[in-house]
Every structure is written in C-alpha cells, then in structure tokens.
C-alpha cells in the first residue's frame, strides 16, 4: 500500500498556570498534525499517543482513541492537547517562567507523537519528533510553524 504521511505542523496554543506553593508550572499544549492518506482506500486513525520532554525528562503524556476515518487521497488536520507539568527537580524553571523582567519565556520542548492507523484490522504506526519553542510565561497562540526550534541536533524529516 501507499504511505500514510504524518506531518507535525507545530504548537497551536499553550495555556499556562502556576502553583506558587509547589513552584510548579502547568502547561496545556495543543499541537496540530496533518495526516494524509495516499492510498486509494479509506484508513482509520485508531489512536494518537503523544509525549512531551523537557531536558530529556518526560513532562506530559496523552492518548486519543478512535479519532477519525480518512478517505482515499485525503488529508485531515487533527489537534491534540498534552497536559504537562514542570515540577520537582525542574522547579528551578518556575523562577524563569515567572520572571517579570523578560517578555518572552521560551523553553525548548521535544514533541513526540505516534499515529496508529488501521485498515481491515491491520495496524501501521508512524512516529514524529520535533523540537518546539513554548512560552511558559503566558498564554500563547501560535501561527502554525511559528514555534519551531531549528537545531543541528534535530533530525531531518
């Protein structure tokens, strides 16, 4: 069969809240994916599993089930939200994210996503990894692709 193409488009929005006592940051990060079915038959997007890493530590996970059916030669844009928590050994970030003297509090997060598609009961998995800038200092909505962090360490897609 032809491929199912999964393209991670970027962060759509990041909504932030804080726990002052625990010096904890809560970031709800909504991401956008484009999934294209290059086959001549419909496929089902069975689930999307996502995780977010900060400084090689997993700070959030999410899973969406029974998402949609994508027709042949069709593309669907799917948004998914990953709730993340920056706390404990990373509580030093609280000071950075709440610092009033700077305007933009960008941190680099690694977004990992795996899409599972099925056709007649057979599954196929496609994974993507992307580094993205997210502002941990305020609620932000992004133009798609605006949050991309280009780094020599980032694998070429």
């Amino acid at each position: 069969p032809r491929s199912i193409d999964v393209k991670y488009i970027g962060v759509k929005s990041a909504y932030v809240s804080y726990d002052v006592q625990k010096r904890t940051i809560y970031l709800n990060i909504t991401n956008t994916l484009n999934i294209t079915n290059n086959n001549y038959y419909s496929v089902e997007v069975e689930n999307i599993t996502a995780q977010v890493q900060f400084s090689k530590t997993v700070i959030g996970k999410a899973r969406l089930n029974n998402i949609t059916i994508i027709g042949p030669l069709d593309m669907k844009q799917i948004d998914y939200t990953v709730p993340t928590v920056i706390a404990e050994e990373m509580s030093y970030m609280y000071d950075f994210c709440t610092l009033i003297s700077i305007k933009v509090h960008n941190i680099v997060l690694m977004m990992q996503v795996t899409v599972t598609t099925t056709y007649f009961g057979h599954s196929e998995q496609i994974s993507q990894e992307r580094y993205q800038y997210v502002d941990c200092g305020r609620n932000t909505t992004y133009q798609l692709g605006q949050s991309e962090y280009l780094n020599v360490l980032q694998p070429q897609q």
Partner: antibody
Framework: QVQLQQSGAELVRPGTSVRVSCKAS????????IEWIKQRPGQGLEWIGV????????DYSEKFKGKARLTADKSSSTAYMQLSSLTSDDSAVYFC?????????????WGQGTTVTVSS | DVVVTQTPLSLPVSFGDQVSISCRSS???????????LSWYLHTPGQSPQLLIF???NRFSGVPDRFSGSGSGTDFTLKISTIKPEDLGVYYC?????????FGGGTKLEMK
C-alpha cells in the same frame, strides 16, 4: 440511479488544450473517487489518473503527468480533465468512472465516453 | 508499474460454449492486508465498459451467475459458463492494488 454524464465530442487543433467534464448524479459525489481512462481507436484501456473530489488530491499514471490535469467542483458534482499540448496521440475516447472509498470495488459505474479528435 | 497480461488475445466461440480468460500480473495483487483489487470488465461496441467481477470473485449487482472469477496472487481467471449473444465484446482485467492501476490488454470474444 447512478449516472456519470460526460461532455460532448471535441475536435481540436494540435498544440491546444481541451477540457472534458463528467457530471455525477444519483450518489454522494464526495464519497467516491473519480478516475479517468483512455481508449485509443482499436486499442485497449489505459488508466490516466484519479481524484478525490472532496479533498482535490490527485494521483496520475507517470505517462500522463504534465498531460492531464484533474479537478472537481463539489458544488456542481462535476469532475474535469484538462488535456494540454495536444497531439494526434491524444485522439481517443476518454471515460470517467467512480470507485467507492471502501470495499475492493473499482470503477463500478462509467460515463458514456467523450471522443477527442486532434486534427489540423 | 505492474504489468497485467491477458490471454488469449482473441477467443472464437459459439453460443452455449463455456470459456475461460486468463489474467496474469507481474507481482502479487494481494496487498499487505490480504485484499486483492482485481476486477473484470466487458466492453461491448458502442457502450461503456461494465463491471462484472470485483475483488477476484465477487459478482457486481445485476451480473448473471454464468460469470465467475477465481484466482489468487498473480494468476486469475474469468469463466463464462454458457455464452449468450450479449456476452460478445472485449473483456479486460484491471489490477487496482498497486498504483497506478493497470489494465490487461483485452480478450476479444467473437463468433466462430
């Protein structure tokens, strides 16, 4: 009932372009692929390409890339095939056909065919 | 592209005969999910081709049961059990598993 009504015969000059239409009725236009097939006089059937009318995404046989361009208008349930830089090799009957998204059915209903004659 | 070879090229028949047409592909037409997109069509003069068989052996609606399809992998057969006048024309097989779709060269069923 399902119908694919194609535009009438065309007599065109070499080097010009022609657009063939295929109007669908009797079914949900965006739930089926539209495919195009060529038949030259005395020859067999040749697959040109396919379009998903809902998304507008197309795929072509290598041979027809740059020759054929497939489009679809959802509002009128009509698919189009434009053929460019016409030569005598493009003189043929062109059929449109539909294929459902699900099941192994391919090309279950066909248009009546449009004859394109390229001549100076 | 997958090459589809049909034999014979021409088949002289008499009404009431039983005939078989063969279709061979250059690679297996079973996709990784086990589905095989192999169809048979009849093209009669002055008409559009009509679907007879899809998915190797499934008769399309309204197709008489004298038409049957069989095969697997790379070898497929269309059988017509009792030839009638309306069965005369050119028969084509089509593989739809591997893009681009490709037709066999056709088999002309004609009177002896």
């Amino acid at each position: 009932q399902v119908q694919l009504q194609q535009s009438g015969a065309e007599l065109v000059r070499p080097g010009t372009s022609v657009r063939v239409s295929c109007k669908a009725s009797g079914y949900a236009f965006t739930n089926y692929l539209i495919e195009w097939i060529k038949q030259r006089p005395g020859q067999g059937l040749e697959w040109i390409g396919v379009i998903n009318p809902g998304s507008g995404i197309t795929d072509y046989s290598e041979k027809f890339k740059g020759k054929a361009r497939l489009t679809a208008d959802k509002s009128s349930s009509t698919a189009y095939m434009q053929l460019s830089s016409l030569t005598s090799d493009d003189s043929a009957v062109y059929f449109c056909t539909r294929s459902p998204f699900i099941t192994t059915v391919v090309a279950d209903y066909w248009g009546q065919g449009t004859t394109v004659t390229v001549s100076s | 592209d997958v090459v589809v070879t049909q034999t014979p090229l021409s088949l002289p028949v008499s009404f009431g005969d039983q005939v078989s047409i063969s279709c061979r592909s250059s690679q297996s037409l079973a996709n990784t999910y086990g589905n095989t997109y192999l169809s048979w069509y009849l093209h009669t003069p002055g008409q559009s081709p009509q679907l007879l068989i899809f998915g190797i052996s499934n008769r399309f609606s309204g197709v008489p049961d004298r038409f049957s399809g069989s095969g697997s992998g790379t070898d497929f057969t269309l059988k017509i059990s009792t030839i009638k006048p309306e069965d005369l024309g050119v028969y084509y097989c089509l593989q739809g598993t591997h893009p681009p779709r490709t037709f066999g060269g056709g088999t002309k069923l004609e009177m002896k």
